[in-house]
C-alpha cells in the first residue's frame, strides 16, 4: 500500500514523545524531504508540492 | 502568507567577509530547498547556491566555491550565506529564493526575497 | 556550462499583438524556468518547467520548447506585461540564466 507522509510523522512524533518520556532520550528530527537536487528531472506539468 | 526577508548586505572592502541572513515565514522550512541568487548591478542573475530541506545536499557554482558556504538552521527558519575573500564581481544584490523540487520534479525558484545589497569596493 | 541567450534584447509590442520571447542553449537542456522582473521588484517564477504557469498567471501566457530552444508567448499583449523576462535552465550545474528580454509597450 501507500505510505502517507503526514502519518509518518505523526508517528514519528508520538515515538519521540515517549523516548523522551521512558528512555530520557533525545531525537531531534527526521526530514523526510531532504533529497538531492533532481538533474534527472524531465520537465512536465504537475501540481507544485 | 510567504514570507522572506534577507539581511546583512554591506559595504566592504575586497578581501573581507560578510554573513548574510534570510529568515522565512509562511511554510514548513525544512521540507524546501533553498537558494541564494544575485543580481549585478547590469541586472544579469547569477545563481550562488542552493541547499537541500535538511542540510545534507549543498551546490555550489565554481565562481563561488571555496569562498562562500550555505547553511540554514531549522529551528529558526534561517538560511545563511557566509562570505569571504570577497571580490568587486561579488558586488550585488543578494536574493533568498525558496526552491520547490522535490526527488523526480522541480518547479522552480518559486519565492524571493526583496534581497540585500553587498557592495565590494575599496 | 550552458549559455543561454535570449533574443530580442529588447522589444515592444502594441496592445493586443501577439508576442514571442525566445531562449537559446548551447547544450540540450531537459526543461527551463521562466521569471518576470519588473523595475524595482525581485524576479517572480512566471512559467516553470518549459509549460507550466505560476500561481497567479494570466493565461495569455504559454511557454514551450525542448532540447535547445524555448520560448515564451503572449498571446494578447496588455500593458501590464511589460517587463524584463528572464529564462533558467537547472538540467545541470551550473545553473544558469539568460540575460533577459525587456519587453516594452508601444
Known amino acids: 500500500g501507500t505510505i502517507n507522509v503526514h502519518d509518518v510523522e505523526t508517528q514519528f512524533n508520538q515515538y519521540k514523545t515517549e523516548a523522551a518520556s521512558r528512555y530520557n532520550l533525545t531525537i531531534s528530527d527526521v526530514s523526510v524531504s531532504d533529497v538531492p537536487f533532481p538533474f534527472s528531472a524531465q520537465s512536465g506539468a504537475g501540481v507544485p508540492g | 502568507e510567504v514570507k522572506v526577508v534577507e539581511s546583512g548586505g554591506d559595504l566592504v572592502k575586497p578581501g573581507g567577509s560578510l554573513k548574510l541572513s534570510c529568515v522565512v515565514s509562511g511554510f514548513t522550512f525544512s521540507r524546501y530547498g533553498m537558494s541564494w541568487v544575485r543580481q549585478t548591478p547590469g541586472k544579469r542573475l547569477e545563481w550562488v547556491a542552493t541547499i537541500s530541506g535538511g542540510g545534507t545536499y549543498i551546490y555550489y557554482p565554481d565562481s563561488v566555491k571555496g569562498r562562500f558556504t550555505i547553511s540554514r538552521d531549522n529551528a529558526k527558519n534561517t538560511l545563511y550565506l557566509q562570505m569571504s575573500s570577497l571580490k568587486s564581481e561579488d558586488t550585488a544584490m543578494y536574493h533568498c529564493?525558496?526552491?520547490?523540487?522535490?526527488?523526480?520534479?522541480?518547479?522552480?525558484?518559486?519565492?524571493w526575497g526583496q534581497g540585500t545589497s553587498v557592495t565590494v569596493s575599496s | 556550462q550552458i549559455v543561454l541567450t535570449q533574443s530580442p534584447a529588447i522589444m515592444s509590442a502594441s496592445p493586443g499583438e501577439e508576442v514571442t520571447l525566445t531562449c537559446s542553449a548551447t547544450s540540450s537542456v531537459s526543461y527551463i524556468h521562466w521569471f518576470q522582473q519588473r523595475p524595482g521588484t525581485s524576479p517572480k517564477l512566471w512559467i516553470y518547467?518549459?509549460?507550466n504557469l505560476a500561481s497567479g498567471v494570466p493565461v495569455r501566457f504559454s511557454g514551450s520548447g525542448y532540447g535547445t530552444s524555448y520560448s515564451l508567448t503572449i498571446s494578447r499583449m496588455e500593458a501590464e506585461d511589460a517587463a524584463t523576462y528572464y529564462c533558467?535552465?537547472?538540467?545541470?550545474?551550473?545553473?544558469?540564466f539568460g540575460s533577459g528580454t525587456k519587453l516594452e509597450i508601444k
Open positions: 529564493t525558496r526552491d520547490n523540487y522535490g526527488r523526480n520534479y522541480d518547479y522552480g525558484m518559486d519565492y
Open positions: 533558467q535552465q537547472r538540467s545541470s550545474s551550473p545553473f544558469t
Open positions: 518547467s518549459t509549460s
